[in-house]
């Protein structure tokens, strides 16, 4: 290019369709210069102009020769340029913010602008830079990029930004610029200029204000507070702790709190102080609602569904900021809201939902919501399988007969479509409880009835009942207990009977035991005793309870004695016993010893004994008839332990084992014995029958049975030299080597001669008896032998 010719051709585009090319005029040319611009392409085009720029349609790929001919007063000059898309710069038009608005409650800025996309021929990616500035000094707060796409038409774009500082605290400015990243353009791409600035500011009233007001925030967050003030702010505190001040425009200040701690229920106070005043706000730092835990829905009555849950972790937010709950049933679209006044019981919350006709399956979603977030729990429930019946009420017991009763109760709810499984607890006094399960068809009217059999007559029972559905979810609570006495029935057995002849052998004494309650089947009023032989039956007068013996004058013929017990309903079967014993000749008296509390008796099985065995016992020292008590055992028994509170150690008892056939008893064994043997309480009385120069004959008596206290096993006889009333040692004192002892184990022996003694010498004699229970006390005597003749 010649000096003085057009130079520095540059082309830019703002829309990829038109290139705006401009050049520098030749030096020294004035205003009146004309230019001819020719573009060498398929059609040779030339343009006449009076200015140094030209808008030409965008050229397709390749090199183009541009000739610029300048025509001026003192001649012309021509410049040739090669133009290629790569030499063109894409500089978008300066964007314009259409609208900048703010939501002061959330400290959010909202930005709106147009991308003017309709002027672009292709789809292109656009990068926007958005600059946020704060305070009058325009401190940069945020620079963000935002991507959009041009799509051939003008598109409105929206962008929002949440400020860490409340928007009321300072003026905020926003600017935008753009960069078009077109894939179809090979030239240089540049950023547009920044848009004209827009700002948002809060118009303070005359009052000093602290922002944000009553904000709810997540524990652990960072938050900025500010004080918009006309007077100088001296300090700021969160709770009782001071915070350094951040100076804003004018007297306005801010503080930044990092990692905020959970608030008390009254919130956390933030205050700013001036010379004469304090300005404050409250912040509530808490948590979003936890997922409701252990959501469970059940019904008591198939009319209303009760859903319970545990809120989980505490939110630390109360009152209007507390978690609100909504229970939504998705099949029906119905919902119920939890009212905060319904204070949780034991940390658990609950809601009632009215059941819907003909709907059994419910899909519940429990939504929890507070200012910091929401959560939910879901449960799908077939409500007929989740019945937790109410506690049965109006529980009553009525007699059917002596072994059956009718139970009735009330169970509120409409259970016509389901069956109940009810558990009846039956408790007899002093015995373990029995439980019976019954299945009952559910009803609409809430009244239920069941019959209970296989009970004992005239027995006090305590009943209670609980119910669940047959599919079983939960038992109801137990009903109140009901005590009931079943009606009487005739006694099921005759009394346990025995008989003894009086000591003079003229009268037969009949004894019987009161029937146990489970056999008496009522209150026994009296007994009938009758006696029958082949010829006749003789009935005695009625004997009122509690007399349990009768006496009949009888000869020695064999009679059958019958005893019948009577209650208000009727008489028991008779108990029969023969008056005479079946004789037994070869009986020996045996010795038996017990085991401290009782005595074990054994015998051989005897197939002849068809009714039972009777063991009778009495105190040996008592007069006839010998009867203290008796015990019946079945005919297949071969042993029994006899125990009685009346048994005492060291007392001798007689035991008799009888076998029964055809109501007649035969004495099989006769025993004497002790429950426990003790040592004798006395020593045998002894006398010296004869003395010589070298011997002494001693004689002693039996110890009475009462003092013996066990079976006598022998005597111990001690003798040695010794004198009465001297200081010489007594015979039984230890360490004496000259003492002689004789153990006499033949208990029938009653005399003893001691030989080889010295004449005219004093001897000390001692006698003691012993049993297996120990050695008894001693009896002693001093004897002087005769002189040798």
């Amino acid at each position: 290019q010649k000096k003085g010719a057009p130079h520095d051709l540059k082309c830019v585009t703002n829309n990829l369709q038109v290139w705006d090319c401009y050049w520098k005029a030749p030096s020294g040319t004035g205003r009146g210069t004309d230019y001819e611009v020719c573009i060498e392409n398929r059609s040779h085009s030339c343009y006449q102009l009076e200015k140094t720029n030209i808008k030409i349609p965008a050229l397709s790929h390749g090199d183009y020769e541009i000739t610029i001919n300048s025509l001026h007063d003192f001649g012309s000059s021509t410049s040739k340029f090669t133009l290629n898309e790569q030499n063109v710069s894409l500089i978008p038009d300066t964007p314009e913010i259409l609208n900048l608005s703010a939501d002061f409650s959330t400290s959010t800025l909202y930005l709106k602008w147009n991308d003017r996309g309709s002027v672009f021929p292709h789809h292109s990616n656009v990068i926007w830079e958005i600059k946020i500035l704060r305070k009058e000094s325009m401190e940069l707060v945020k620079l963000v990029t935002h991507n959009t796409t041009l799509n051939g038409k003008d598109t409105l774009h929206h962008w929002s930004w949440a400020s860490d500082m409340p928007l009321e605290c300072a003026i905020h400015f926003v600017e935008i610029r753009c960069y078009i990243d077109s894939l179809h353009f090979s030239g240089r791409k540049e950023w547009s200029d920044w848009s004209p600035v827009k700002n948002i500011s809060w118009m303070p009233d005359s009052q000093t204000k602290v922002f944000p007001q009553d904000k709810v925030i997540l524990v652990g967050s960072d938050i900025t507070f500010c004080c918009i003030s006309q007077e100088k702010v001296l300090s700021a505190l969160i709770g009782h702790t001071n915070c350094p001040l951040i100076h804003l425009d004018g007297e306005n200040v801010a503080i930044k709190i990092h990692n905020i701690s959970v608030s008390a229920s009254s919130g956390t106070n933030v205050v700013f102080t001036t010379e004469d005043n304090i300005f404050g706000t409250v912040i509530f730092a808490g948590y979003p609602p936890d997922t409701p835990q252990q959501l469970n829905c059940e019904t008591h009555d198939l009319k209303e569904i009760l859903c319970r849950w545990n809120p989980g972790r505490a939110t630390a937010l109360v009152g209007p900021r507390a978690t609100s709950y909504t229970l939504l049933e998705s099949f029906s679209g119905k919902y119920v809201r939890f009212k905060r006044a319904e204070a949780p019981t034991n940390g658990s919350y609950q809601l009632f939902f009215q059941m819907l006709p003909n709907q059994e399956i419910y899909n519940f979603t429990l939504n929890a919501h507070n200012p910091l977030g929401r959560s939910e729990s879901t449960i799908l429930v077939n409500i007929t399988e989740k019945v937790y019946p109410h506690t049965p009420t109006s529980f009553k017991v009525k007699d059917i007969n002596s072994t059956a009763v009718k139970l009735s109760w009330h169970l509120p709810g409409n259970f016509a479509k389901i069956n109940f499984l009810c558990q009846i607890e039956i408790k007899k006094s002093n015995t373990v409880q029995e439980q019976r399960n019954v299945t009952i068809k559910g009803v609409e009217n809430s009244s239920y009835l069941v019959a209970l059999d296989k009970l004992n007559p005239y027995t006090v029972y305590t009943f209670r009942i609980r119910c669940s559905t047959e599919t079983f979810w939960k038992w109801s609570k137990w009903s109140n207990k009901k005590q009931h006495l079943t009606t009487e029935a005739i006694p099921s057995k005759g009394p346990d009977t025995w008989r003894e002849w009086s000591s003079d052998g003229k009268n037969l004494i009949i004894y019987w035991k009161p029937l146990p309650i489970n056999e008496a089947n009522g209150k026994i009023l009296s007994y009938n005793v009758s006696c029958s032989s082949d010829e006749e039956t003789q009935s005695l007068s009625e004997i009122p309870d509690p007399q349990h013996k009768a006496e009949i004058q009888l000869d020695k013929n064999d009679y059958i004695i019958s005893v019948v017990a009577k209650n208000s309903v009727g008489s028991s079967p008779p108990s029969k016993i023969a008056s005479m014993e079946i004789p037994n000749d070869d009986l020996k008296i045996e010795q038996v010893v017990g085991m401290g509390k009782g005595i074990l008796l054994t015998w051989h099985y005897d197939p002849n004994m068809t009714c039972d065995y009777v063991i009778k016992w009495c105190n040996s020292s008592r007069s006839e008839p010998c009867l203290m008590d008796w015990r019946k055992v079945p005919s297949n028994s071969t042993e029994t332990v006899i125990e009685s509170d009346q048994f005492r150690p060291g007392v001798r008892y007689n035991f008799f084992l009888y076998g029964c056939r055809n109501q007649g008893y035969q004495l099989l064994r006769s025993m004497i014995g002790y429950i426990e043997e003790l040592a004798p309480t006395v020593a045998p009385n002894f006398t010296v029958e004869d003395t010589s120069a070298d011997s002494i004959l001693v004689k002693w008596e039996d110890i009475p049975v009462e003092e013996l206290r066990g079976f006598l096993r022998g005597y111990l006889f001690y003798f040695g030299k010794g004198e009465r009333d001297t200081s010489k040692m007594r015979v039984l004192e230890s360490g004496r080597s000259d003492i002689k002892v004789k153990n006499i184990t033949d208990i029938s022996q009653k005399t003893l001669r001691i030989a080889d003694l010295q004449g005219k010498t004093s001897y000390h004699l001692v006698l003691r008896a012993y049993t297996d229970g120990g050695v008894g006390p001693e009896k002693s005597m001093y004897v002087v032998t005769k002189e040798n003749s």
Epitope: S235, L237, H240, T241, N242, S266, V271, T273, N277, I278
Partner: antibody, heavy 116, light 107 residues
Framework: QVQLVESGGGVVQPGRSLRLSCAAS????????MNWVRQAPGKGLEWVAV????????YYADSVKGRFTISRDNSKNTLYLQMNSLRAEDTAIYYC?????????WGRGTLVTVSS | DIQMTQSPSTLSASVGDRVTITCRAS??????LAWYQQKPGKAPNLLMY???NLENGVSSRFSGSGSGTEFTLTITSLQPDDFATYYC?????????FGGGTKVEIK
């Protein structure tokens, strides 16, 4: 746990000086304004002075203004009260208390007796 | 300076009683009021701040109310541990000022 321990009290003649100290532990001393509060025998509480958390601002009760000086050393976690020109009416238990506005923790106090 | 007046100066009560102490400010102090409890020979203890905010660790038997110039401290069911002297304090502006105190004694 938070602890404030006052020291430096004692018997002093009128017109003389005394310096009280308060040693703080168990909290970030440099984040709290600190006060001196006194209580004359058998009487109520009387606020004496406050110092900002960073020592930048101090206020005094009219009864001690010009005679008492409150100061702090955040590096030593210690609060001071320099008392000059003491008078008989300054006799009291002097408490050091934490908190610029509300005193949420108090020391056990140190007794100052001004007597000739 | 803001003057604080407490009434009564002495109050006799029994265990289980409901007790109310009043505090008046000579000018409006909004809610910038604290209550302290002091037992003989001991330092004061903060009970309540901003008129009605209970300090951490203080029994919920204590409650506060009021704003402007009239304030009350209420003990719902007096316990043996509550027999002490109670002070109110304004902190709206310096100098901080205390009430004269209310001694709660056993009837």
């Amino acid at each position: 746990q938070v602890q404030l321990v006052e020291s430096g009290g004692g018997v002093v003649q009128p017109g003389r000086s005394l310096r009280l100290s308060c040693a703080a532990s168990g909290f970030t001393f440099s984040s709290y304004g600190m006060n001196w509060v006194r209580q004359a025998p058998g009487k109520g509480l009387e606020w004496v002075a406050v110092i900002w958390f960073d020592g930048s601002i101090k206020y005094y009760a009219d009864s001690v203004k010009g005679r008492f000086t409150i100061s702090r050393d955040n590096s030593k976690n210690t609060l001071y009260l320099q008392m000059n020109s003491l008078r008989a009416e300054d006799t009291a238990i002097y408490y050091c208390a934490r908190g610029q506005l509300v005193q949420d923790f108090w020391g056990r106090g140190t007794l100052v007796t001004v007597s000739s | 300076d803001i003057q604080m007046t407490q009434s009564p100066s002495t109050l006799s009560a029994s265990v289980g009683d409901r007790v109310t102490i009043t505090c008046r400010a000579s000018q409006s102090i909004s809610s910038w009021l604290a209550w302290y409890q002091q037992k003989p020979g001991k330092a004061p203890n903060l009970l309540m701040y901003k008129a009605s905010n209970l300090e951490n660790g203080v029994s919920s038997r204590f409650s506060g109310s009021g704003s402007g110039t009239e304030f009350t401290l209420t003990i719902t069911s007096l316990q043996p541990d509550d027999f002490a002297t109670y002070y109110c304090q304004q902190y709206k502006s310096n100098p901080l000022t205390f009430g004269g105190g209310t001694k709660v004694e056993i009837k």
